[in-house]
Amino acid sequence: SSSPTSSASSFSSSAPFLASAVSAQPPLPDQCPALCECSEAARTVKCVNRNLTEVPTDLPAYVRNLFLTGNQLAVLPAGAFARRPPLAELAALNLSGSRLDEVRAGAFEHLPSLRQLDLSHNPLADLSPFAFSGSNASVSAPSPLVELILNHIVPPEDERQNRSFEGMVVAALLAGRALQGLRRLELASNHFLYLPRDVLAQLPSLRHLDLSNNSLVSLTYVSFRNLTHLESLHLEDNALKVLHNGTLAELQGLPHIRVFLDNNPWVCDCHMADMVTWLKETEVVQGKDRLTCAYPEKMRNRVLLELNSADLDCDPILPPSLQTS
């Protein structure tokens, strides 16, 4: 699992009277915020399903794994986790399902060890371009993030404020080139219609990329060439019709890659010939024997690996003078 986990066995719960602890004072070593459970042995704090409306101010300095899931946070302001002394050990932060709709510039500043961040299942209508980079400089200080989980962060369609959701997310990923060290990026279930062409080239350390359950129709303008470390590429449950030669060659050229292509509406006409040939030869596609045609109707449910060139025809396009009404 990509979420922060812990082996915590003994959690101490805070007493309600700690809710009004003075945030200006450094927390006591064994202090646990109200409505949270803490285990110093496991370096873990869990504030889960407690309807918190703000990040607790009195987090213990030892925290390495912080779960703030299932809350009512709404907004992460700049410096939401900035503390004196800083939370220098915090490595894994899970904010999934906390009704966040706004993440402001510098929200994760002053977390020098933060390697794993999960913002999944929040309707992020307003994700600042500088949410992860912390500054608007053309080149920011490198972020320590290695794993960024952004599954199902798309707001409902009527709440997207008339701008490209894909563009907003990509702007945050690329700002200041802060995420050059990112190894895992999960963007599943976000209704992405396209992948902006520059995004992957600027994330050269990626090992794992999950774009499953989106609405991607084509990868024609997406380049995988720079992703020499890429180990897994999840493209299941999209709207892909065919992969063209350029994409096939790039994928084949990646030394460690495994590609997942299940449940796409493959169009088995003459444009599919190159992909079928490639599928028969390649070892990079996992479960390639499960890939089936969706269109045209006469080809529905045919297994791609079982097709030959004679099966893959395109209906001739009649000149206008010969077309009938």
Epitope: N51, Q72, V75, L100, P123
Partner: nanobody
Framework: EVQLVESGGGEVQPGGSLRLSCAAS????????MAWFRQAPGKGREFVAA????????RYAESVKGRFTISRDNAKNTLYLQMSSLRAEDTAVYYC???????????????WGQGTLVTVKP
């Protein structure tokens, strides 16, 4: 500027329920948070509850937790406050407000309705 119009106030017995509504003249995209405040006779304006237009996060004053429920209908640009187990101390003018912040302070909100009176008495 968003026009806010409250309705649904009235007189009710202790333990009873009321549902307040607040209709916004348009979708307040610039106002990310909608809230209810109240002002009892001779007292200051007090935060009751708030909800985000997007995402629907909610927050409540301690005094109403478990008794009041705030909600919104995005399609109708309307905010609601379902009040149950009403007490005499809930008697007040209830105001609808819209603002940018996710806050509980009067100053977090820029647009206000005219208020609707809720009276709880035997």
């Amino acid at each position: 500027e968003v026009q806010l119009v409250e309705s649904g106030g009235g007189e009710v017995q202790p333990g009873g329920s009321l549902r307040l509504s607040c209709a916004a003249s348009r979708r307040p995209f610039s106002s990310k948070t909608m809230a209810w405040f109240r002002q009892a006779p001779g007292k200051g304006r007090e935060f009751v509850a708030a909800v985000r237009w997007i995402g629907g996060a909610t927050r409540y004053a301690e005094s109403v937790k478990g008794r009041f429920t705030i909600s919104r209908d995005n399609a109708k640009n309307t905010l609601y406050l379902q009040m149950s187990s009403l007490r005499a101390e809930d008697t007040a003018v209830y105001y609808c407000a819209a603002g940018q912040a996710w806050g509980t302070k009067f100053t977090d909100y820029s647009d206000w309705g005219q208020g609707t009176l809720v009276t709880v008495k035997p």
